[in-house]
Interface confidence: low
């Protein structure tokens, strides 16, 4: 994975929240849910009320990157999805408000959002080769690809 030092000179400025209260389903149609107080997992749900609802905030890069850079917040909370290292669970970081500017090691809060048809991918800005992923019998984590599932469907208007 790419070291933080490659990215430390890039500054990301918060623009606005671009999506509210959406659900993320992986390619096996498993929804992301709260495993416990600090991290997430995926499960096939009969009732989508149990799924985690996310908000997505957009950031603009000082590098004028063509990629869409986003932060993921659990709706109605002050918990933000934070990347660690490869095969490590993504964590939920508590912050009083959405960061106005992000740079350096704080880029573990940011993801490049890419869409291919109905498939959505979230690549860690801190680790550009790694994606938010689900893995059997494990937390939602960062992974480079199979056997982890890295593509998600966004289900909106579930509130």
């Amino acid at each position: 994975s790419a070291p933080f030092s490659f990215l430390s000179n890039v500054k990301y400025n918060f623009m606005r929240i671009i999506k509210y209260e959406f659900i993320l389903n992986d390619a096996l149609n498993q929804s992301i849910i709260r495993a416990n107080d600090q991290y997430l997992t995926a499960a096939a749900l009969h009732n989508l009320d149990e799924a985690v609802k996310f908000d997505m905030g957009a950031y603009k890069s000082s590098k004028d990157d063509a990629k869409i850079t986003v932060i993921l917040r659990i709706s109605k909370t002050q918990l933000y999805v934070t990347a660690q290292d490869e095969d490590q669970p993504v964590l939920l970081k508590e912050m009083p408000e959405i960061p106005k500017t992000i740079t350096g090691s704080e880029t573990n809060l940011l993801f490049f959002w890419e869409t291919h048809g109905t498939k959505n991918y979230f690549t860690s800005v801190a680790h550009p080769n790694l994606f938010i992923a689900t893995k059997q019998d494990y937390w939602v984590c960062l992974a480079g690809g199979p056997p982890s599932i890295t593509d998600f469907q966004i289900l909106e208007n579930q509130a």
Epitope: R34, Q38, Q78, K93, E94
Partner: antibody
């Protein structure tokens, strides 16, 4: 059953340092954040900080930045609160409390330690 | 920051009484309201979370209600062991403030 057991009462002089422990049992320590809450005599309960028991990272309330340090010994399922350069106004009972989000968004503290009384007096 | 107010700081009642303790938030907290009991020996327990849900092991004589900014805790049949101070707390936004507490005493 779930228990949080704190260290005993402390009597300190101004300028000294105190370190309080909170040992958790009955659940997976790294799955839940830990709070520290202050209750000064005759005052409200006040949440001082939340510590992520997976990373050890703390989020401090505004009034508790500077002289306060929160740490973990994960292998022993223990959280610590250290207060440096003690002042008279630090006289209080300090509680550790496990944090939990109900329904994904409503925060509560579902299990509490018995409290540790700290008295600062010259 | 959201402020929590418990206007009644102490309350006197008789065993067997129905007692209601109220709590007001300075803005809408969307039912993210918890109640805690602090016994005279200092021990604190969560009684009710998310306005009306009983925490495990809490007797059914305790109940909670409310919405928006106004919430209440009711003890339907007061027992000696309920003598304590009761605190509300909002769980909606940091720093998750507590109310000042209501001390419940026996007549």
């Amino acid at each position: 059953q779930i228990q949080l057991v704190q260290s005993g009462p402390e009597l300190k002089k101004p300028g000294e340092t105190v370190k309080i422990s909170c040992k958790a049992s009955g659940y997976t320590f790294r799955n839940y954040g830990m709070n520290w809450v202050k209750q000064a005599p005759g005052k409200d309960l006040k949440r001082m900080a939340w510590i992520n028991t997976y990373t050890g990272e703390s989020t401090y309330a505004d009034d508790f930045k500077g002289r306060f340090a929160f740490s973990l010994e994960t292998s022993a399922s223990t959280a610590y609160l250290q207060i440096n350069n003690l002042k008279n106004e630090d006289t209080a009972t300090y509680f550790c409390a496990r944090g939990i989000y109900y329904y994904g968004s409503s925060y509560a503290m579902d299990y509490w330690g018995q409290g540790t009384s700290v008295t600062v007096s010259s | 920051n959201i402020q929590m107010t418990q206007t009644t700081s102490s309350l006197s009642a008789s065993l067997g009484d129905r007692v209601t303790i109220s709590c007001r938030a300075s803005q809408d907290i969307s039912n993210c309201l918890n109640w805690y009991q602090q016994k005279p020996d200092g021990t604190v327990k969560l009684l009710i979370y998310y306005t009306s849900r009983l925490h495990s092991g809490v007797p059914s004589r305790f109940s909670g209600s409310g919405s928006g900014t106004d919430y209440s805790l009711t003890i339907s049949n007061l027992e000696q062991e309920d003598i304590a101070t009761y605190f509300c707390q909002q769980g909606k936004t940091l720093p998750y403030a507590f109310g000042g507490g209501t001390k419940l005493e026996i007549n």
